[in-house]
Interface confidence: low
C-alpha cells in the first residue's frame, strides 16, 4: 500500500542477524548436510579439465573409486587445506583433484581432456538465492540501497561478531553478501557507511531469474529444486528413485546434473528428488515476459475446424487453399525458416500439416512449390460453421453446441443426473429440452457464460472453455426493470454501544505464502475468502494459510483475537476475471474481530465520486514500516473518465471498476493484491472490488481499476451454495 | 484399462465400524494420490478424504476426522477407508477415486480426480 512516494522496503522484515538470533532449522533445500551424497551440488562439464597458469593456486589429489568421493569431500573440507570450490574427476587414473578455484577464476584455463569431468559447486557459480540464501557463495558485494559491503574480517566502521574463522564454511570472504545464519531477509552484510550497520542485498531469487516458454519441453536453464524447495536428483543417478530417464538414452532432452526439465509432455519442467517419499515434483519455473502462449490463452485445440485464427488446429490439412501441398515443418528444402519442431515444441508442427504457430490469421504452411514461400490453408472450414455453434452469444443461454468439457479438462456428466442439484439453485423450470445428454450449457443464466456439471466432487461444476462470438456486443449484465441498481442491501453496519468496534476491518484477511504475507484477501462468508488468483504461485495448498483478526501483519499484538486458517480449495474466476474463491479448511469463528463483509448486489452501480477505501499490508514505501494494516481513501470514477487519466490506452469494460485516490501518491500496491476496495451505501459497507496487479503503484494522476465485484456476484453466490462445506 | 473396485460395504449399526477397500487396476497405481467421496441418498457427491501416492499425506473432510481413516498399500494396489463411531448420516454409496495428477503434494480438496469406482453402499441403522 502506497502512503506516499518513498524508498524500497524489505528491511522492514525486521532482519535481526546478529543481534538475539536463536539456531535456525533449516529447510530441506538449503540444508541437511549429513553423511549424504552431494553431488547433486555441483555443475559437471564432461571431458573437461582445468589447467592453472597461476602456479601460487592449489591443488589436493587423492585415489579414490568414484565422483560421488570427490564430492562428499569437496563439500565438507575435510582434509583440504583450502576451500573447495570444484573438482575434477580423473576417470582413467580414478583420482581426484580439488580445487580452491572454478572455472571462472583468474589464473585458470579450462581443457580439453577425455577421461577428465569437471564439476563445480554451484553455489561457487550461482548469482541468485534459493530460499533464504543461506548457501550463497557469490560475489555480490554491494546492498540494496547501493552501499558497498564492510570486510567480514574487518572491524571498521562497524564491529562484530561474524569473524570466517567463526564460521567455517559460511565463506564469508572478502566483503561478499552473505547470509550465515540464514535470516528472512536473505544475503546481507555489514556496510562501508558508519550510520548504516547493516542491510540485506538485492540479490534475486533463482525462480525468478529462470524462466521458460510455453511448457518448458526446451527449457535448459539451472533450477535444480523443485516448487516445495526439495533438492532435484540428479539425471545420471539412480537413487534414490530408480527411472528410465538416462542421460545417455536421451541425449537431446538436457539432462545436465540435476536441473529441472520437461522430457515427457508434462504441463511444465519437473524432476526426481532427493527426497525419498517423494519420487517427484514439478519446479517453480515462471513463464517468460515473451512466452509465444500463455496459461491463461491456450487455444482450444481443434482437427475439423478453425477456432478463432486457428492456433489450436490440430488436424491434418497439408495443402494451402490451391492445392499446393505444404513443406514439412522439419525440413529446409525448398525454404529455409526456423519455424522448426524443435524452436517450437507445443505448436503441433508434425508432418506438413496446416498451423498456426505465430498467432498468423489463420493456419499456413511452408509449400513445396519453390516459387511460393507460403500460403494459408484458408479452405479449412471455421467451427462457427461447421459445428454450429463453437461460440456463444450474449450470456449463451440459447448456446446449443456439442463441447462436453470443462475448462480444466473434465468431462461433464449427464444433465439428468444433476437436475436436482440444478433445482437447488434455480427457481424456475430449466427448458430440459436444451439439455440434452452432457453438453455444455447455461440453464441459470449465468453471466459469464455455458458450464456444466463435473463428476467430481470438488469441482461440482465448471464453466466450459467457449468463448463469445466475435463483435458480439449483447451485455450480459441486462437488468430492464431496474436501469440503475443499487449496490447495498437494506441492512445496518453493527455497532456495539454506539462505537463501530474492530469489526470494520475484521473481514480483512492476510493470505501467508509459506509463513510470510503475500496478499489481501476478504471474508465474504465463515469458509470462503475472495482474493486474486496472482496470489497463489505454488500449486500446494499446504504453502498457504489465512490469518483473520489481526491488524499487524506479523500478528504482534493480535494473539487473543488472531485466527489461523489453512486452506482447503481454489476456486478459480470465471475466464478473465483474476478472481480467487478461497475455503477455508474449517470456518471462521465471527467475533469482535473476525466479520464478514457484504456483497454488492449483482450488477449494481455505484455513484461517480463514491468515497471508498482500500485496505493492505503491502509494500508501503517506507523503510520502517510498521507492518500495521493501512488505508487509502479512493473515489469511484466512471469508467470513460478513467480511461482519460489513463491516456486513452486503457478500455474499460463492464467488470472493471475505477477509483482514484484523494491523496496523490496513495493507492494499493504489491502485498495488498487480493484486498478489498469498500465502499459505503445506505451506511453499508460492502467489498466494491478487488485489487489485481495494475499499472505501476500509486502513479498520480492514474487511477486504480480494480476487479468489479459486482459483475462476479453471482458467481460468488453460486460457489457458495453449490461448492459445500462440510459441516463440522 | 483403468479400474477401481470397491467392496466392504454392508449394513452396520451406529456406533459400529467398517472397513471399505479399493482394487486398483490399468495404471501404476503409486504414482498416484487416490480418494473417497461419498454419495448420500438423494444429495450430490460429498469428498470425504485422500491419501498422497506414498501415504505420507492424508486429508479429511471436517466431519469425518477422527473417526475415519484413510490408508494405502502400494505393494496391493489396494486402498483402505476406516470408519469408526459410524452414524445414520454416513449412509451413503462410497466411491473411491484416482487423482488426475500423479503428484503427491496435489493430494487433497485442492485435486482431480479422473476415474471413479461402482461404490459399494454403506447403510448405518439400528
Known amino acids: 500500500m502506497w502512503v506516499t512516494k518513498l524508498l524500497p522496503a524489505l528491511l522492514l522484515q525486521h532482519v535481526l542477524l546478529h543481534l538475539l538470533l536463536l539456531p535456525i532449522a533449516i529447510p530441506y533445500a538449503e540444508g541437511q548436510r549429513k553423511r549424504r551424497n552431494t553431488i547433486h551440488e555441483f555443475k559437471k562439464s564432461a571431458k573437461t579439465t582445468l589447467i592453472k597458469i597461476d602456479p601460487a593456486l592449489k591443488i589436493k589429489t587423492k585415489k579414490v573409486n568414484t565422483a560421488d568421493q570427490c564430492a562428499n569431500r569437496c563439500t565438507r573440507n575435510k582434509g583440504l587445506p583450502f576451500t573447495c570450490k570444484a573438482f575434477v574427476f580423473d576417470k582413467a587414473r580414478k583420482q581426484c583433484l580439488w580445487f580452491p578455484f572454478n572455472s571462472m577464476s583468474s589464473g585458470v584455463k579450462k581443457e580439453f581432456g577425455h577421461e577428465f569431468d569437471l564439476y563445480e559447486n554451484k553455489d561457487y557459480i550461482r548469482n541468485c538465492i534459493i530460499g533464504k540464501g543461506r548457501s550463497y557463495k557469490g560475489t555480490v558485494s554491494i546492498t540494496k540501497s547501493g552501499i558497498k559491503c564492510q570486510p567480514w574480517s574487518s572491524m571498521i566502521p562497524h564491529e562484530h561478531s561474524f569473524l570466517p574463522s567463526s564460521y567455517r564454511g559460511k565463506d564469508l570472504q572478502e566483503n561478499y553478501c552473505r547470509n550465515p545464519r540464514g535470516e528472512e531477509g536473505g544475503p546481507w552484510c555489514f556496510t562501508s557507511n558508519p550510520e548504516v550497520r547493516y542491510e540485506v542485498c538485492d540479490i534475486p531469487q533463482c525462480s525468478e531469474v529462470e524462466c521458460m516458454t510455453c511448457n518448458g519441453e526446451s527449457y535448459r536453464g539451472l533450477m535444480d529444486h523443485t516448487e516445495s524447495g526439495k533438492i532435484c536428483q540428479r539425471w545420471d543417478h539412480q537413487t534414490p528413485h530408480r527411472h528410465k530417464f538416462l542421460p545417455e538414452r536421451y541425449p537431446d532432452k538436457g539432462f545436465d546434473d540435476n536441473y529441472c526439465r520437461n522430457p515427457d509432455g508434462q504441463p511444465r519442467p519437473w524432476c526426481y528428488t532427493l527426497d525419498p517419499h517423494t519420487r517427484w515434483e514439478y519446479c517453480a519455473i515462471k513463464t517468460c515476459a515473451d512466452n509465444t502462449m500463455n496459461d491463461t490463452d491456450v487455444p482450444l485445440e481443434t482437427t475439423e475446424c478453425i477456432q478463432g485464427q486457428g492456433e489450436g488446429y490440430r488436424g491434418t490439412v497439408n495443402t494451402i487453399w490451391n492445392g499446393i501441398p505444404c513443406q514439412r515443418w522439419d525440413s529446409q528444402y525448398p525454404h529455409e525458416h526456423d519455424m522448426t519442431p524443435e524452436n517450437f515444441k507445443c505448436k503441433d508442427l508434425r508432418e506438413n500439416y496446416c498451423r498456426n504457430p505465430d498467432g498468423s490469421e489463420s493456419p499456413w504452411c511452408f509449400t513445396t512449390d519453390p516459387n511460393i514461400r507460403v500460403g494459408y490453408c484458408s479452405q479449412i472450414p471455421n467451427c462457427d460453421m461447421s459445428h454450429g455453434q463453437d461460440c456463444y452469444r450474449g450470456n449463451g443461454k440459447n448456446y446449443m453446441g456439442n463441447l462436453s468439457q470443462t475448462r480444466s479438462g473434465l468431462t461433464c456428466s449427464m444433465w439428468d443426473k444433476n437436475m436436482e442439484d440444478l433445482h437447488r439453485h434455480i427457481f424456475w423450470e430449466p427448458d430440459a429440452s436444451k439439455l440434452n445428454e452432457n453438453y455444455c450449457r447455461n440453464p441459470d443464466d449465468d453471466a459469464h457464460g455455458p458450464w456444466c456439471y463435473t463428476g467430481n466432487p470438488l469441482i461440482p461444476w465448471d464453466y466450459c472453455p467457449i468463448s463469445r462470438c466475435e463483435g458480439d456486443t449483447t451485455p450480459t449484465i441486462v437488468n430492464l426493470d431496474h436501469p440503475v441498481i443499487s449496490c447495498a442491501k437494506t441492512k445496518q453496519l453493527r455497532v456495539v454501544n454506539g462505537i463501530p468496534t474492530r469489526t470494520n476491518i475484521g473481514w480483512m484477511v492476510s493470505l501467508r505464502y509459506r509463513n510470510k504475507h503475500i496478499c489481501g484477501g476478504s471474508l465474504i462468508k465463515e469458509s470462503w475468502v475472495l482474493t486474486a488468483r496472482q496470489c497463489f504461485p505454488s500449486r500446494d495448498l499446504k504453502d498457504y494459510e489465512a490469518w483473520l483478526g489481526i491488524h499487524d501483519v506479523h500478528g504482534r499484538g493480535d494473539e487473543k483475537c488472531k485466527q489461523v486458517l489453512n486452506v482447503s480449495q481454489l476456486v478459480y474466476g470465471p475466464e478473465g476475471s483474476d478472481l480467487v474463491l478461497m475455503k477455508l479448511a474449517r470456518p471462521a469463528v465471527l467475533d469482535d474481530f473476525v466479520s464478514t463483509i457484504d456483497l454488492p448486489n449483482y450488477g449494481c452501480t455505484i455513484p461517480e465520486k463514491t468515497s471508498c477505501s482500500v485496505y493492505g499490508w503491502g509494500y508501503t514505501g517506507l523503510i520502517n514500516y510498521d507492518g500495521l494494516l493501512r488505508v487509502a481513501h479512493l473515489y469511484i470514477m466512471g469508467n470513460e473518465k478513467c480511461s482519460q487519466h489513463h491516456r486513452g490506452k486503457v478500455t474499460l469494460n463492464e467488470s472493471e471498476i475505477c477509483a482514484g485516490a484523494e491523496k496523490i501518491g496513495s493507492g494499493p500496491c504489491e502485498g495488498d493484491y487480493g484486498g478489498p476496495l469498500v465502499c459505503e451505501q445506505h451506511k453499508m459497507r460492502m467489498v466494491l472490488g478487488v485489487i489485481v496487479p495494475g499499472r505501476g503503484c500509486a502513479i498520480p494522476n492514474r487511477p486504480g481499476i480494480f476487479v468489479r465485484v459486482a459483475y462476479y456476484a453471482k458467481w460468488i453466490h453460486k460457489i457458495i451454495l453449490t461448492y459445500k462445506v462440510p459441516q463440522s | 484399462e483403468v479400474q477401481l473396485v470397491e467392496s466392504g460395504g454392508g449394513l452396520v449399526q451406529p456406533g459400529g465400524s467398517l472397513r471399505l477397500s479399493c482394487a486398483a487396476s490399468?495404471?501404476?497405481?503409486?504414482?498416484?494420490?487416490m480418494s473417497w467421496g461419498r454419495q448420500a441418498p438423494g444429495k450430490g457427491l460429498e469428498w470425504v478424504s485422500a491419501?498422497?501416492?506414498?501415504?505420507?499425506?492424508?486429508y479429511y473432510a471436517e466431519s469425518m476426522k477422527g473417526r475415519f481413516t484413510v490408508s494405502r498399500d502400494n505393494a496391493k494396489n489396494t486402498l483402505y477407508l476406516q470408519m469408526n463411531s459410524l452414524k445414520s448420516e454416513d449412509t451413503a454409496v462410497y466411491y473411491c477415486?484416482?487423482?488426475?495428477?500423479?503428484?503427491?503434494?496435489?493430494?487433497?480438496?485442492?485435486?482431480?480426480?479422473?476415474?471413479w469406482g461402482q461404490g459399494t453402499q454403506v447403510t448405518v441403522s439400528s
Open positions: 491419501i498422497s501416492w506414498n501415504g505420507g499425506s492424508t
Open positions: 490399468g495404471f501404476t497405481f503409486d504414482d498416484y494420490a
Open positions: 477415486a484416482k487423482a488426475l495428477d500423479p503428484l503427491g503434494v496435489l493430494a487433497g480438496t485442492s485435486g482431480i480426480y479422473d476415474y
